[in-house]
Amino acid sequence: SEEPPISLDLTFHLLREVLEMARAEQLAQQAHSNRKLMEII
């Protein structure tokens, strides 16, 4: 039988919130860096 996609791994369920938060934090940092770069330019 075919293996389930990663969303069926229990880990995905238990870490979903923290991984989403980490990703949002990463995107915010990226946006901040981009703004700083634009200011310099």
Partner: antibody, heavy 118, light 112 residues
């Protein structure tokens, strides 16, 4: 069948880094998170972190943040755990492990002994 | 961090007799989804841990039915109905309900 085969034992000096590998087979590598757990000699188990081989999402136990780096190579179905600024307390057996839809550590590698000694 | 406390530290047993290991969490480990992610692992000397029980009372595939798990909230128990020689080793409880995930200190099951 699911198999996780780890790299061999390492001896390192304090302050150095070590990189342990974990080659997965018997399943689709990108379908399951990979975790790392360590066990100091005669001690209990300590969860270090987890990586999503599909998207590269990583979540580290705060205790190891800044010293541990987890990566994957999808082309070879291999996960890596690098620990830097080694100290004697890092002497331990390091395990990779995979879960299922029901449990977090259903399959384990054989372990890699890392000895930190001057 | 959720501290998982196991008792006893060592459990001397007679083969064929029952054994019981207790695990207490420092706070409730009921997850926000109403499940309790309490697992039990067996580690024989020189081997990696092996999953026995997940979500408090469910036996993993291939685990003999002499192993059973029970409990709720903060108090959990692993029972071996009749200890066999291959059951000797260290048993760990583990909680996956709260980050960071944490293991108990272990209970050594040995021959009396």
């Amino acid at each position: 069948q699911v198999q996780l085969v780890q790299s061999g034992a390492e001896v390192k000096k304090p302050g150095a880094s070590v990189k342990v590998s974990c080659k997965a087979s018997g399943y689709t590598f990108t379908d399951y998170f990979m975790k790392w757990v360590r066990q100091a000699p005669g001690q209990g188990l300590e969860w270090m972190g987890v990586i999503n081989p599909n998207q590269g999402d990583i979540f580290y136990n705060q205790k190891f943040k800044g010293r541990v780096t987890m990566t994957v190579d999808k082309s070879t179905s291999t996960a890596y755990m690098e620990l830097s600024s080694l100290r004697s307390e890092d002497t331990a057996v390091y395990y990779c492990a995979r879960g299922t839809d029901r449990a977090l550590f259903a399959y384990w590698g054989q372990g890699t002994l890392v000895t930190v000694s001057s | 961090d959720v501290v998982m406390t196991q008792t006893p530290l060592s459990s001397p047993v007679t083969l064929g007799q029952p054994a019981s290991i207790s695990c207490r969490s420092g706070q409730s480990i009921v997850h926000s989804d109403a499940n309790t992610y309490l697992e039990w692992y067996q580690q024989r000397p020189g081997q990696p841990p092996r999953l026995l029980i997940y979500k408090v009372s469910n036996r993993f595939s291939g685990v003999p039915d002499r192993f059973s798990g029970s409990g709720a909230g903060t108090d959990f128990t692993l029972k071996i109905s009749r200890v066999e020689a291959e059951d000797l080793g260290v048993y760990y409880c583990f909680q996956g309900s709260h980050i960071p995930w944490t293991f108990g200190g272990g209970t050594k099951v040995e021959i009396k």
